[in-house]
């Protein structure tokens, strides 16, 4: 019989139901925006906006200050008062649409849904390690703004994304707003604009550059701005918008818009379609070629990547990569495949594709029929012509007009569909040591911290825990403060360490010490923890072996038993080769001699499952007593593995030494030709791992083995004669003298 240790699922080494409590702040209303500030003198702050209020928190998430930002028209509105005596516009609640830092000052800028979407500038006043907001400045000059020309109207009630860039001695606000006909008619916000904050903070400079969805498309063509960021020489906006101006407006796709961060101009505004797909390793019949499209971006973040992921993406370590979480449609849930997929777009590659697209449009020979695109922003035209013109005039350049790049950038899910039913709603990527970690918030209020690698068929979790009991979705925007990330869910802000909330979810010593170095996990006797949790016994250098099972559960008191031990931390080496003298197994008082691993039996174990096997030959000592006893495995002097060395003892109860007894054999005769079915009756006949019935020294082929009975078929006899019959268990003869008589056939 070839008994094998049962596989232990990889998931059994961790428990994602472990409760972690992380610092939190209750904002008193749904969190609408959040941003963090870290000064150069150890002062820091978290700014949290809810309807009609802006909270200033210290680095410990304790409230430092609170400011009333609405309702507009209410005498208690502190920001409104900065604009002088009103009325300034229709009364109403202020929902914060923009909350950004102008790091050059430093100052916080907030813009709301009320008062024509105007903004307020709050200078930061360091006070010890905390920060206070100075009296707000109203970034609005009443006599400069009209409904048809309003440089100080920034925020759209439908959503606005802002990235602040310092150019020269000025701050430029790169603004992208969602519009519809009603919003566009009211103080004319623009879809995309670059606005310079005036040095005296009286508002934004007039005559700013802008692009807007053309009036005829405003009803049917809506653009959602999901994310914006600045890296290198460019500012990028990520959008979800209809794939076509003319076709079904519900057929959406994702685009990246690129603007120059060094020149406040929109002539080199470029768009590129981002295509993210789930391509399972084994394609289902009927599944689309190239994988299932996930066209709708839900969240995004850009970050420099660690060495391992950089290698997999064929880029240099530390290069910036845009990560996006995509879904199949606005409602999120697909028919087949995972709910969310994650695609990685290296920024350098994005820029190269855009530059190649410009060459295709502007360098001869230009492919006939190649459109400039962006027909929702500008008059249709063919390359290389400027928008709305039949031909280039001598003093215009093809390159100085907005362009949609004709090819898309296609990527496949980094997680190979392993996110499964998880609906990711927030994303922040960090580089820790050589590792790139995705910190994800989910629809059901959990945080998943997972290493970003593409070559595996399982997820490498740093953690997976519930933020609180509310189960509300984690919001899109995540901020970093020192070694923590701030996530918002419902009316709460949570502070999550980038190294993970703890180590208690790792259940085994091996899993604990294999955790990433940055997590600071160590083994504390019987649990995984950080040093501060168990200073006494905490260590990171060794694990005891762990016995989980053995086979068989009984063996003969006389004779040997081949014992198979199951568990973990036996070898730390896939080959399972054991150096001489390192492993000691005792069963009761008796030693069990280690057996060399049978290489023919070695088989690859998928990493999702794990088990180690160890075989030894048990020869009971003469002093060994019958009855139940323990199996003990002690490992010493093992050379260290990659993560730790094995050292220690594991004991498991449940082995019994037994004495087999043979009580009866029948029939006692049979034909010389053999084939007689012998029945041997007794006790403990099935103990151990080997048994043999010998008829005149030749094995009687066992047909059935049970505790009280053995059945076997006699071998042919040489002559008609009475011959000895014996039973051996574990190579030792069971007491008793029996004969079998061969007769003529």
């Amino acid at each position: 019989e070839d008994w094998q240790c049962p596989r232990t699922p990889y998931a059994a080494s961790r428990d994602f139901d472990v409760k972690y409590v992380v610092p939190s702040f209750s904002a008193g209303g749904l969190v609408q925006a959040m941003v963090t500030y870290e000064g150069d003198r150890n002062e820091s702050a978290v700014f949290v906006a809810i309807r009609n209020r802006l909270h200033v928190l210290g680095p410990d998430l304790k409230s430092v200050q609170s400011l009333a930002t609405g309702p507009a028209g209410d005498p208690g509105c502190q920001t409104c008062a900065a604009c002088g005596p009103g009325p300034h516009g229709p009364p109403g609640d202020t929902d914060t649409k923009v909350l950004v830092l102008d790091p050059a000052l430093p100052a916080l800028v907030s813009c709301g849904s009320s008062l024509q979407g105007r903004c307020f500038l709050h200078d930061l006043e360091p006070q010890g390690t905390a920060v206070h907001l100075a009296a707000p400045a109203c970034l609005f000059s009443a006599h400069h703004n009209r409904p048809d020309d309003c440089p100080d109207c920034v925020a759209s009630p439908l959503g606005t994304r802002v990235t602040v860039v310092e150019q020269g001695q000025a701050s430029y606000f790169y603004v992208a707003s969602s519009l519809d006909a009603a919003v566009a008619a009211s103080f004319s916000p623009r879809s995309v604009s670059i606005r310079r904050l005036k040095a005296d903070a009286s508002g934004f400079a007039p005559g700013f550059v802008a692009l807007s969805v053309l009036p005829k498309h405003l009803v049917s063509y809506s653009i959602e701005y999901v994310h914006s960021f600045h890296t290198g020489a460019f500012v990028y906006f990520l959008t979800v918008q209809p794939a076509s101006v003319t076709d079904d407006p519900s057929a959406l796709h994702t685009r990246l818009a690129r603007l120059s961060a060094t020149e406040p101009e929109l002539g080199d505004y470029r768009e590129l379609v981002l295509d993210c797909r789930f391509a399972p390793k084994r394609r289902r019949r009927g599944a689309p070629e190239g994988g299932q499209p996930y066209p709708v971006l839900r969240v995004a973040h850009s970050a420099p990547v660690g060495a391992q992921l950089a290698t997999e993406l064929s880029i240099a370590e530390g290069q910036e990569v845009l990560f996006g979480v995509f879904v199949t449609g606005k409602d999120g849930g697909p028919g087949v495949g995972p709910n969310s997929v994650v695609c990685a777009f290296p920024i350098d590659l994005l820029d190269t594709l855009i530059d190649e697209g410009v060459e295709r449009c502007c360098e001869s020979p230009v492919h006939p029929g190649l459109r400039r695109g962006l027909d929702f922003f500008q008059s249709p035209s063919f390359c290389p012509n400027p928008p709305g013109l039949e031909a280039l005039s001598p003093n215009t350049s093809c390159r100085h007009f907005p362009l949609l790049v004709s090819s898309s950038f296609s990527r496949v899910d980094l997680f190979n569909g392993l996110l499964g039913p998880v609906q990711v709603t927030a994303l922040y990527v960090t580089r820790l040591d050589n590792v790139t970690v995705a910190h994800m918030g989910t629809m059901d209020g959990r945080i998943l911290q997972v290493e970003l690698v593409r070559s595996l068929n399982y997820l490498l979790y740093v953690s997976n825990f519930s933020l609180g009991d509310s189960g509300q979705p984690v919001q899109r925007d995540v901020s970093r403060l020192g070694d923590h990330l701030l996530f918002a869910s419902g009316d709460q802000v949570f502070q999550v360490p980038i190294q993970g909330p703890g180590c208690r979810h790792f259940l085994t010593c091996g899993r604990c010490l294999r955790a990433w170095h940055f997590m600071g996990c160590g083994w504390c006797g019987n649990m995984c923890g950080q040093q501060k949790e168990c200073p006494g016994s905490w260590q990171q250098d060794h694990c005891p072996p762990k016995l989980t099972e053995f086979h068989p559960h009984s063996g003969p008191l006389r004779g040997s038993t081949r014992l198979t031990l199951c568990g973990s931390n036996f070898y730390l080496h896939p080959s399972g080769l054991v150096p001489e003298g390192t492993h000691q197994v005792t069963v009761g008082q008796s030693p069990c001699r280690p057996l060399p691993k049978d290489s023919s039996k070695l088989r690859p174990v998928p990493r999702k499952d794990f088990v180690e096997e160890f075989e030894c030959e048990l020869e009971p000592l003469g002093t060994q007593a019958v009855g139940p006893t323990n199996v003990s495995l002690t490992v010493t002097n093992m050379p260290p593995g990659k993560h730790f060395r094995v050292d220690g003892t594991s004991v498991l109860r449940g082995f019994s030494f037994m004495e087999p007894v043979l009580i009866a054999v029948q029939p006692l005769f049979g034909p010389r030709a053999g084939g007689t079915c012998l029945t041997l009756e007794g006790q403990s006949l099935s103990v151990g791992t080997s048994r043999a019935v010998l008829v005149n020294g030749t094995e009687c082929l066992l047909a059935r083995v049970s505790e009280g009975q053995l059945l076997c078929a006699t071998p042919p006899g040489a002559t008609v004669a009475s011959v000895p019959l014996s039973l051996q268990v574990g190579g030792a003869q069971v007491p008793g003298s029996w004969t079998f008589q061969y007769r003529e056939d």
Partner: antibody, heavy 116, light 109 residues
Framework: EVQLQQSGPELEKPGASVKISCKAS????????MNWVKQSNGESLEWIGD????????RYNQKFKGKATLTVDKSSSTAYMQLKSLTSEDSAVYYC?????????WGQGTLVTVSA | DIQMTQSPASLSASVGETVTITCRAS??????LAWYQKKQGKSPQLLVY???TSVEGVPSRFSGSGSGIQFSLKINSLQPEDFGSYYC???????????FGGGTKLEIK
């Protein structure tokens, strides 16, 4: 390249008026306020006032109200400062400087001498 | 109006020395402070703005610090071309008009 080109030196009699100019190039003239700064011989710098070329709005240092008048001509991207009722106290170098967090761009200065 | 008090009014130092000029505002001006170098017959040159942001092209030996009411400009390892006058300047910011300090004349020893 941003440049501010000022008019040449002026010699005026007490009681007279003078109008000095500052022609801007290399940027969008209407997008930035223009500031005027005075430096008397051996003295510190004094901010006179500024003008918003887009809307024409002005602000003055209290000390120069009634003394200086700031105007612009958008078509020629030129800012002007007129000083009236000149006295010897007005003898100085006058600079135009483009708005910014700190004035990074300055004209070369116009020397105004008031002498009988 | 905000007053800017600069000290010392004059200072002599040798090439290679490090010098510090300070500026005090009569009220909190946050980080809205600029420093200029002014040489005879030349326009002022912006060195630092927002109290500590160095202007591109300005040698790294010039550095600004401070916030609120107390500010300083430090010049490491003085070079012959560094001699001249230095002015602090309360930048234009919300509700506040620009004001210059009285200046510091840095002379060669």
């Amino acid at each position: 390249e941003v440049q501010l080109q000022q008019s040449g030196p002026e010699l005026e009699k007490p009681g007279a008026s003078v109008k000095i100019s500052c022609k801007a190039s290399g940027y969008s003239f209407t997008g930035y306020n223009m500031n005027w700064v005075k430096q008397s011989n051996g003295e510190s710098l004094e901010w006179i006032g500024d003008i918003d070329p887009y809307y024409g709005g002005t602000r003055y240092n209290q000390k120069f109200k009634g003394k200086a008048t700031l105007t612009v001509d958008k078509s020629s991207s030129t800012a002007y400062m007129q000083l009236k009722s000149l006295t010897s106290e007005d003898s100085a170098v006058y600079y135009c400087a483009r708005e910014g967090r700190g004035f990074a761009y300055w004209g070369q200065g116009t020397l105004v001498t008031v002498s009988a | 109006d905000i007053q800017m008090t600069q000290s010392p009014a004059s200072l002599s130092a040798s090439v290679g020395e490090t010098v510090t000029i300070t500026c005090r505002a009569s009220e909190n001006i946050y980080s809205y402070l600029a420093w200029y170098q002014k040489k005879q017959g030349k326009s002022p040159q912006l060195l630092v703005y927002n109290a500590k942001t160095s202007v591109e092209g300005v040698p790294s030996r010039f550095s600004g610090s401070g916030s609120g009411i107390q500010f300083s400009l430090k010049i490491n390892s003085l070079q012959p071309e560094d001699f001249g006058s230095y002015y602090c300047h309360c930048q234009h910011h919300y509700g506040t008009l620009p004001t210059f300090g009285g200046g510091t004349k840095l002379e060669i020893k």
